[in-house]
Amino acid sequence: NECPKLQPPVYGKIEPSQAVYSFKDQVLVSCDTGYKVLKDNGVMDTFQIECLKDGAWSNKIPTCKIVDCGAPAGLKHGLVTFSTRNNLTTYKSEIRYSCQQPYYKMLHNTTGVYTCSAHGTWTNEVLKRSLPTCLPVCGQPSRALPNLVKRIIGGRNAELGLFPWQALIVVEDTSRVPNDKWFGSGALLSESWILTAAHVLRSQRRDNTVIPVSKEHVTVYLGLHDVRDKSGAVNSSAARVILHPDFNIQNYNHDIALVQLQKPVPLGAHVMPICLPRPEPEGPAPHMLGLVAGWGISNPNVTVDEIILSGTRTLSDVLQYVKLPVVSHAECKASYESRSGNYSVTENMFCAGYYEGGKDTCLGDSGGAFVIFDEMSQHWVAQGLVSWGGPEECGSKQVYGVYTKVSNYVDWLWEEMNSPRAVRDLQVER
């Protein structure tokens, strides 16, 4: 009662391999790595057959089929390319994930190469079965920022795409009687978060209580160049308005806030985030040059008091920018202490500007980012936020602009952006 000699399947083997198989002998059919046993349209690792009493095998020898990982999953803000000809998805085939450059980059700087494993899954050496993450590229505008010194006071225009992180924040407080409307600037930190100054988002009350404006009253414009033409801009409503809990209206200490957008904004040449600095108390060093942009007052003949009294918020139609040097804390403190009025320059602030004046930020520029180029990382970093200035006119001699020192708040910002109160689980690269 011998059974016929067995031929192992292509890409497979039979164990045990014997010269003769008799009644009740069993053999196990298995496949090479990267192949699976195919029997009656079912896929399995091994298949057992037995030599029956009548000298026949209990089943036919199955075939070995190459493992197929199937079509790779799509990647948010990324794409997948096949490294193997004919877009093969079978064992040992390779694919490469990449992010939508230059607006997104891969987290952990992985190669993005995945191989179809013997288990039928696309696998990466580092990430194993997890997909890579495409994070927004920060602080790298698609057009290089020029070295020209321009001014916001009496200034010239910025070109579209020079400050892709720049946001116009419009607050229309309909809870007020009569309605109150004002604006400020902000800086995009990720697809869903805007960094700005707390005083921009504080309700303009008749007392000094710090109460944030309702989220329903906030509109954010991104990719905006000329405020008269908002057609090319992305506008978004706010999901949350978060003022720093210690913001003090009397001295503008802790003048920092966040807006979470209702929906993530698509990034592109005109909408890109700015980088946050490393958390360090020193802040930017004196004499370092920074850039700040805004739609605030650009007419040097109009006084701040005239604007406040008239109730209008005169603004520049086209985004303006200025290059300003950081001023030492001691010099700035001294310049304000010599003035009448209670002006305290705290450790959470730094100053920028020229002793001789002429270049400055002004009313309406509030909340915009003071950005400095970081040579090490080759990114622009938001070191400051336009906060306040002296009692004299913008650009006056020896009146420096005062900026919120962002590096003192990096931990608070990450905490808020990743808190469970955030509307969605939005990842931001640290």
């Epitope: 407080d173 309909t174 809870s175 007020r176 009687v177 005083h199 309700s203 009350r205 008749r206 007392d207 000094n208 209580t209 109460i211 309702s214 209206i249 009397q250 001295n251 503008y252 701040v304 008091d305 406040i308 009025g341 209670n342 002006y343 306040w388 009692p391």
Partner: antibody, heavy 114, light 112 residues
Framework: QVQLKQSGPELVKPGASVKLSCKAS????????INWVKQRPGQGLEWIGW????????KYNEKFTDKATLTVDVSSSTAYMELHSLTSEDSAVYFC???????WGQGTLVTVSS | DIVMTQSPSSLAVSAGERVTMSCKSS????????????LSWYQQKPGQSPKLLIY???TRESGVPDRFTGSGSGTDFTLTISSVQAEDLAVYYC????????FGGGTKLEIK
């Protein structure tokens, strides 16, 4: 139009408590605080405290921290002030105001008498 | 606590005259950052609720006649009625909102 309607006059015995109401209409109740002000007969105005309906935060004039309790019912857009341990010194007209004093209630006269 | 002192406590003027009344605070009510003085003026006519006239020391509340003008900064403030009308008979109060709220004692305006 904006209105703040206060509850009617109260005659209460010394040592008792009284709860005054102020119903708001015509504006966003939660986005504006409600202030309470006391005026004794023939005297000036005295600020008692304010309450902010959006988050329930309250600020009191120190003098009134043990005397008054401020609350709101957002569902009915109504603010309340309860006055405790009343004495003749508490006999006064009590006003509520809203939208940062742009609008005032008509006042509630509280008379404390045995 | 901030103390508010109003003067005079009362004054009598004829219709059409210009009148000024003063309000002094025990500390500055100016917040340099906002360039605002946190001081308001109220009018209370006999048997009525108070009415807001001026806030931020000089901003007229909507609907208030332009004969009412607020001025001053820091600790010294003035309410001016350029041409007094019979209906201006009232007590005028100032109030600070720099640190919580405090009312002044009031100035009673009588018409001769």
């Amino acid at each position: 139009q904006v209105q703040l309607k206060q509850s009617g006059p109260e005659l209460v015995k010394p040592g008792a408590s009284v709860k005054l109401s102020c119903k708001a209409s015509g504006y966003t109740f939660t986005s504006n605080d409600i202030n309470w002000v006391k005026q004794r007969p023939g005297q000036g105005l005295e600020w008692i405290g304010w309450i902010y309906p959006r988050d329930g935060s309250i600020k009191y004039n120190e003098k009134f921290t043990d005397k008054a309790t401020l609350t709101v019912d957002v569902s009915s857009s109504t603010a309340y002030m309860e006055l405790h341990s009343l004495t003749s010194e508490d006999s006064a007209v009590y006003f509520c105001s809203g939208v940062e004093d742009s609008y005032w209630g008509q006042g509630t006269l509280v008379t404390v008498s045995s | 606590d901030i103390v508010m002192t109003q003067s005079p406590s009362s004054l009598a003027v004829s219709a059409g005259e210009r009148v000024t009344m003063s309000c002094k605070s025990s500390q500055s009510l100016l917040i340099s950052r906002t360039r605002k003085n946190y001081l308001s003026w109220y009018q209370q006519k006999p048997g009525q609720s108070p009415k807001l006239l001026i806030y931020w020391a000089s901003t007229r509340e909507s609907g208030v006649p332009d004969r009412f003008t607020g001025s001053g900064s820091g600790t010294d403030f003035t309410l001016t009625i350029s041409s007094v009308q019979a209906e201006d008979l009232a007590v005028y109060y100032c109030k600070q909102s720099y640190n919580l709220y405090t009312f002044g004692g009031g100035t009673k305006l009588e018409i001769k």
